[in-house]
Structure formats: structure tokens, C-alpha cells
């Protein structure tokens, strides 16, 4: 699996998980989260060559055209696969509030 | 939906489905595959700015991220999201076998 | 919250010999691939190298190639860049940043290490 545990240990050119750790503040302008500060939200990034951890039958075709046809810019691209919730607090008034935001931590990617 | 009656009329520069037509012996070098002798797969393409069709609450996140730091080249990417099937006559030997290959035709697209 | 100090740099002259350090601290060093960034005067931030999280795999810039060596010691959170046959070039702040730098350029998060290669 393109995961934490294979990614960040090879720290691969082809498609793979990178880490991301986003301020809430400073990196998307949003102060009504009391807690946490920021998460590891991670991302997807890297090439998908032909049968590097294809998702389905169509982006095994367009990674095979691809390499038959380096110049179409037609090639499958790295993205989310396993998502995970995050939960915060936050204060209405001066009611606390606690939320789990779903599909805020990506956990493994693939190429599609 | 980021599909064929929206984009194909749109020519979007962001996110959107594209035609491609693939020929399976020109492009794939397969030449297992009697008929069709090659089929309308299109593909996804295009920018993926903030709220554009965002698939999930990390897509949303990390378009954002994108925004507020244009260098850091971390942001979503234009993928498939309805597929669709290929029915295709191949021969073992004399004997026709018709298949239906699955997930082989791109409908719509989306921001993951 | 996630903290980056580096440190080690100076003045030294052509072809001479450098090491720099980060010392990391608010998360878990061990689980994250590191990299170093620079900035050289009135340019924009240039990924260096990068290290996986075990130290095993390693990649560098074409720039540093061969001169660089990036290494880490996961038992003192540290990270490390031993720069030999330093050139004019070279002069820049030097930052080390959390996860794989060639993908996302994040904001340095210390304050960085000067280096100035000069005769």
C-alpha cells in the first residue's frame, strides 16, 4: 500500500504519500478551530507510470498509452485512496463544541 | 457533473472530461482484441481550484492550502469518477469469447 | 507545535567544508522524511535533498550531487547536511523542513543557517 509506512520511509518518485502538516491558521485563514492548532493531513504526489498502483482498468489503459505516447499528457495522476476523519473543537458563543470533520487525513494513495 | 454534455460543449480550462479515442493496436500495442478495433475512453484534465468540484473535505482542504500558498505545489488533482464498461470480441483460438471489460470508459470527472 | 532550528553556518572559503544541523521538536521526528531548502539571495526557495524517515533512501538536487550528504539521527531528532567542495553558489539560508520538499515547498518553519562561500 502507497501508506505512511512505505512512503515516508522511501520517500519514492512515483506516486506516494507526502507529508503535509497544515496550520489552520496560517495555511487556510481559519480561526474558529479552538483545537488542534494544525493536523497531518498528507497528501498525494508523484508520477504513475505504467501498473505503479493502478485503481482501475482505465488508468492502467491511459499509463500504457502514455508510455506509447510520452507527448499526449493523457496519464492517470496520484491521488487519495484511504481518507480519515479528524476531530476538533470549536465555540459557538462560548459553547464548546467538538466535530469530526470526515475525509480530513489522507492515509494511502493510488494512481487513477 | 463534470461530464460529456457540460464539458465537451465548455472547452474548460479547469477540471473537466476530455475526448481521447484510443486505438487498441496504435496505442496499447494490443492486438488480442478483435472488435471494437478501438473505443472513446476520454480522460481527466484540467486545474482544480478552490471549490472546483472538490470531492472530498481534504480536496476542499488542500485547494485551499493551494490558495493561500501558490509555491508550494501541493493540490488536488483532476481524476475519473464515473466509469463505465467495454464490451469487446476477442478469439481464443477460433472460438469467439465476448467480454465486458470493466471501468474501461470515463464518464465524469471530479477534484480528489 | 512543530519546531525547526537550524544551525551551523558561516563564512567559509571556496571549496571548503560545512556541516549543518536541525534540531526538531513537537512531533515525531522518527515517522518523517526531512529535507533541506535554500534560498540564495533574491531567489525563490530550491529543494537541496531529502532523507526517508529510517535514513536509508536519500535524493539530491543535480546542483549538490556528489558534495552534498544528507544524513539523520533519529535517537537526538536531529537532521544533518555535510556540505563539502562548497562554490559561490552555494551561498544561501539553509532550512530543513518536515516531509519530501520536491512536492511541497512548505513555509520555513525556522529561522535558517547562513552560508557564504567567499574567498
Known amino acids: 500500500a502507497l501508506d505512511a509506512a512505505y512512503c515516508f520511509r522511501n520517500v519514492q518518485d512515483n506516486c506516494c504519500l507526502r507529508p503535509l502538516y497544515i496550520d489552520f491558521k496560517r495555511d487556510l485563514g481559519w480561526k474558529w478551530i479552538h483545537e488542534p492548532k494544525g493536523y497531518n493531513a498528507n497528501f498525494c504526489a508523484g508520477a504513475c507510470p505504467y501498473l505503479w498502483s493502478s485503481d482501475t482498468q482505465h488508468s492502467r489503459v491511459l499509463s500504457l498509452y502514455n508510455t506509447i505516447n510520452p507527448e499526449a499528457s493523457a496519464s492517470p495522476c496520484c491521488v487519495s485512496q484511504d481518507l480519515e476523519p479528524l476531530t476538533i473543537l470549536y465555540y459557538i458563543g462560548k459553547t464548546p463544541k467538538i466535530e469530526q470533520l470526515s475525509n480530513m487525513i489522507v492515509k494511502s494513495c493510488k494512481c487513477s | 457533473a463534470l461530464d460529456a454534455a457540460y464539458c465537451f460543449r465548455n472547452v474548460q480550462d479547469n477540471c473537466c472530461l476530455r475526448p481521447l479515442y484510443i486505438d487498441f493496436k496504435r496505442d496499447l500495442g494490443w492486438k488480442w482484441i478483435h472488435e471494437p478495433k478501438g473505443y472513446n475512453a476520454n480522460f481527466c484534465a484540467g486545474a482544480c481550484p478552490y471549490l472546483w468540484s472538490s470531492d472530498t473535505q481534504h480536496s476542499r482542504v488542500l485547494s485551499l492550502y493551494n490558495t493561500i500558498n501558490p509555491e508550494a505545489s501541493a493540490s488536488p488533482c483532476c481524476v475519473s469518477q464515473d466509469l463505465e464498461p467495454l464490451t469487446i470480441l476477442y478469439y481464443i483460438g477460433k472460438t469467439p469469447k465476448i467480454e465486458q471489460l470493466s471501468n474501461m470508459i470515463v464518464k465524469s470527472c471530479k477534484c480528489s | 507545535q512543530l519546531q525547526l532550528v537550524e544551525s551551523g553556518g558561516g563564512l567559509v572559503q571556496p571549496g571548503g567544508s560545512l556541516t549543518l544541523s536541525c534540531l526538531a521538536s513537537?512531533?515525531?521526528?522518527?515517522?518523517?522524511?526531512m529535507s533541506w531548502v535554500r534560498q540564495a539571495p533574491g531567489k525563490g526557495l530550491e529543494w537541496v535533498s531529502v532523507?526517508?524517515?529510517?535514513?536509508?533512501?536519500?535524493h539530491y538536487s543535480d546542483s549538490v550531487k556528489g558534495r552534498f550528504a544528507i544524513s539523520r539521527d533519529n535517537a537526538k531528532n536531529t537532521l544533518y547536511l555535510q556540505m563539502n567542495s562548497l562554490k559561490p553558489e552555494d551561498t544561501a539560508v539553509y532550512y530543513c523542513?518536515?516531509?519530501?520538499?520536491?512536492?511541497?515547498?512548505?513555509?520555513?518553519r525556522g529561522q535558517g543557517t547562513q552560508v557564504t562561500v567567499s574567498s
Open positions: 523542513a518536515e516531509g519530501d520538499s520536491r512536492y511541497v515547498r512548505n513555509r520555513a
Open positions: 513537537g512531533f515525531t521526528f522518527s515517522h518523517y522524511p
Open positions: 532523507i526517508g524517515s529510517d535514513g536509508a533512501i536519500k
